[in-house]
């Protein structure tokens, strides 16, 4: 028996009542040690116990009036009072007492963290941790095995196992994502350590296998056949090839490479969207040079971990046959342009040079030539250019011609080339005065005075610099009034050979001058220099002679 520490008069046993009882249960008895059994004491419950518990007022027996659920409430704290009915007063102070609800195994284990999902790499070794599941049991863990749980695998063999006491799920057999990528595992949790009468609960775990790069890409076609026109420009797509990889995502990203292409004519790039290999033309092809190509292409993954490298040895290859299709191509001149030289003055019909164009195609069509750009030339069937007129370098030193070659088998196929004809100089022009000289001598000129400086020009082209030679004509015997001196620099001076001239005696002198060039053979011209006598006055300057001469000619005398 227990006694209340504060109130020594109360006596009761520890109260325990089982949960889940369908009938009224006797819990125990409260009594006061002052109670002598003469039925004058009355027992009362106060407070919270009113609904679930009742007390026999005469005996102090306590009863559970309804089914109790330990998992809802495991302890009840009640207050009791004892009254002596003869005097109508409490004989003991109010006291609290406790009723404990004892556990029965009425709750199954429950998985509270559902849904369970786990991801684990494919081909993970045995023993790899996948996920831990935990079941909770609401029963009293201190009451026998009511809340002692064991786990077992209901579905998932042979790939998974569960540790019975921890709920840790591990891999028990390697799995290949490419065969199956999702697994459904069912775990059962039993209380009572699985003994008879145990309650159980189950949960489902969805386990996804993540991809590892354990598959290399493989060409489904062992070879491909493409055709390309020889007129296709570089950069043209020839065709597309495709390898397949059972992996996904980054592990399926692949790279194509050309293994053997000595010609370096093809390239391959990847279409990142479709993972196709696009074969492109890197350099133009020429049917006449090579019309069949073969290239071997290798495919490999872009991202391969070192430990998975063994799965990627002996990369898959495919062979591509490329057939070049012939295009009728225009003629090709043997040179990009032609430069010919011909001396001027040659008779018409003189051969200038020969151009030549060929058909690059196999049929080797003959050519027909035509020429535009000048009526001075013509071209014959062999591509030989001839003159049709006398050429004069001093009229035109260069001719810019255009020659066209047309295939006789296909007149649509035409090409043209520039022909530059240089007319070479021959010495066919004698030198002459560089200008028309107005030369004057003053009446009061002194002997040896420079009357005029002269120079010459020559319409011929000079390989080096022209050199001119000046001489007073030997025919000009009657003219001793002037002398000529060659300066040896392509100029000469005319000097007065006497002192004083008179307008009354002679108004004008004509001096015959010979000018020779340095051509081979040299050419000489006869040139007349007119020297007019002028009244210069005291100044002895010829600056005003032109106007004076004009007035003189008009019949006036200038003072």
């Amino acid at each position: 028996d227990y006694k209340d520490d504060d109130d020594k008069g109360w006596v009761w046993k520890q109260f325990v009542v089982p949960e889940e009882m369908d009938t009224i249960q006797h819990v125990g008895r409260l009594r006061s040690d002052l109670d002598n059994g003469n039925n004058s004491f009355q027992y009362k419950l106060l407070g919270t116990g009113d609904g679930s518990f009742s007390i026999d007022e005469k005996t102090g027996d306590i009863f559970a009036m309804q089914k109790l659920d330990r998992e809802k409430q495991s302890l009840y704290i009640l207050r009791a009072q004892v009254i002596d009915t003869t005097i109508g007063k409490a004989v003991e102070p109010e006291s609290e007492f406790v009723i404990r609800v004892s556990d029965v195994n009425d709750n199954e284990p429950r998985f509270l963290d559902e849904p369970y999902e786990a991801i684990v790499p494919e081909m993970s070794p045995e023993g790899t941790f996948v996920i831990k599941v935990t079941a909770n049991d609401a029963d009293d863990p201190t009451s026998g095995y009511h809340a002692r749980i064991l786990y077992n695998l209901e579905q998932g063999q042979p790939y998974f196992s569960v540790e019975p006491t921890t709920g840790v799920i591990r891999i028990s057999s390697k799995m290949d994502r490419e065969l199956q990528d999702t697994y459904c595992v069912i775990i059962q949790a039993k209380d009572m350590l699985g003994q008879p009468g145990a309650l159980s609960g189950t949960t489902t775990i969805s386990i996804k296998l993540s991809d590892i790069n354990d598959n290399k890409p493989i060409f489904k076609e062992s070879f491909y056949r493409f055709t390309i026109s020889e007129s296709a420009p570089s950069g043209t797509t020839i065709g597309k090839i495709m390898a397949y990889d059972d992996d996904i995502g980054e592990n399926a990203e692949m790279d194509y490479s050309i293994e053997d292409d000595e010609s370096q004519i093809f390239d391959i790039v990847i279409d990142n969207e479709t993972q196709e290999g696009i074969v492109i033309l890197k350099k133009k092809v020429d049917f006449e040079h090579q019309n069949h190509y073969g290239i071997r292409v290798k495919v490999k993954n872009c991202h391969v971990d070192e430990e998975l490298a063994p799965a990627h040895v002996n990369a898959s290859t495919t062979y591509i046959k490329v057939q070049v299709e012939d295009e009728d191509e225009p003629p090709t001149f043997l040179l990009p342009y032609y430069i010919f030289e011909i001396p001027e003055g040659k008779p018409y019909g003189t051969m200038v040079g020969t151009v030549s164009a060929v058909d690059p195609d196999r049929r080797q069509s003959p050519m027909r030539y035509s020429l535009i750009g000048s009526k001075m030339f013509d071209i014959n069937g062999n591509g030989t250019i001839v003159t049709t007129n006398l050429l004069d370098r001093e009229v035109s030193a260069w001719y810019n011609l255009s020659v066209t070659a047309t295939e006789t088998y296909n007149v649509q196929q035409i090409s043209s080339a520039h022909v530059y004809v240089q007319v070479l100089n021959i010495n066919d022009h004698a030198p002459e005065f560089s200008q028309l000289y107005e030369t004057y001598v003053c009446e009061n000129a002194e002997s040896g005075e420079i009357i005029q400086t002269i120079s010459a020009i020559d319409r011929d082209e000079s390989i080096e610099d022209h050199h001119f030679y000046f001489n007073h004509s030997v025919e000009d015997t009657n003219n001793s009034s002037f002398i000529l001196t060659d300066n040896q620099d392509n100029t000469a001076v005319i000097l007065s050979n006497r002192a004083g001239f008179s307008l009354k005696e002679e108004t004008v002198f004509y001096m015959i001058i010979l000018i020779a060039d340095n051509g081979i053979p040299p050419l000489t011209s006869t040139n007349t220099l007119t020297i007019q006598v002028c009244d210069c006055g005291d100044s002895r300057s010829t600056e005003t002679c032109t106007s004076k001469e004009l007035l003189f000619i008009m019949g006036f005398k200038a003072e």
Epitope: F223, Y224, H292, Y319, K321
Partner: antibody, heavy 120, light 107 residues
């Protein structure tokens, strides 16, 4: 294993047209990527390629014979044929049909050949 | 067209000896575009080597090919009695042409 068999007349008169057929067995003539050729060998001489055809019907001929040659294909019969017009005695030869390889334009499979004599 | 020249025209050797057959092209060809054939009397040619060193299916390893550019070689390391016959080279880059052949006969 692909097998090829040539058939056709063994004697053709000058100026006429030589016609031969090659029947393919052990594989489809429509197999993607393969070219079907005709090759000839003059008696005691070397080999001369005549031309080839793809199952789609596109053909390519030896330029020196191009003006006289026609090669055609009949996929339903798994056959391809050669026609060589305006024949002369110089066309007397053993005619072979052949198929190229999967790794190049070499000739991997050959028929046993048929001798065609051009004579009046 | 590319012209192939084979030398020697005839090669006289004994069984067990090494045979070296040459094939020369009139202009450069990629080594990927050359093949060798064996032809026995009354039979069709038989592919030996392509590309120029890959052996065709069923070809014994005593046959090997090499070369590049314009010069190519077929080597038979130890001649067997059945190897005494005619050998042709073929280029398949610019159209298709064959060499005139080399005859290997028993000395």
């Amino acid at each position: 294993q692909v097998q090829l068999q040539e058939s056709g007349p063994g004697l053709v008169k000058p100026s006429q047209t030589l016609s031969l057929t090659c029947t393919v067995s052990g594989g489809s003539i429509s197999s993607s990527g393969y070219y079907w050729s005709w090759i000839r060998q003059h008696p005691g001489k070397g080999l001369e390629w005549i031309g080839y055809i793809y199952y789609t019907g596109s053909a390519y001929y030896n330029p020196s014979l191009k003006s006289r040659v026609t090669i055609s294909v009949d996929t339903s019969k798994n056959q391809f044929s050669l026609k060589l017009s305006s024949v002369t005695a110089a066309d007397t030869a053993v005619y072979y049909c052949a198929r190229d390889g999967s790794s190049g334009w070499y000739f991997q499979y050959w028929g046993q050949g048929t001798l065609v004599t051009v004579s009046s | 067209e590319i012209v192939l020249t084979q030398s020697p025209g005839t090669l006289s050797l004994s069984p067990g000896e090494r045979a070296t057959l040459s094939c020369r092209a009139s202009r450069n060809i990629s080594s990927s575009y050359l093949a060798w054939y064996q032809q026995k009397p009354g039979q069709a040619p038989r592919l030996l080597i392509y590309g120029p060193s890959s052996r065709a299916t069923g070809i014994p390893d005593r046959f090997s090919g090499s070369g590049s550019g314009t010069d190519f070689t077929l080597t038979i390391s130890r001649l067997e009695p059945e190897d005494f016959t005619v050998y042709y080279c073929q280029q398949y880059g610019s159209s298709f042409t064959f060499g005139p052949g080399t005859k290997v006969d028993i000395k």
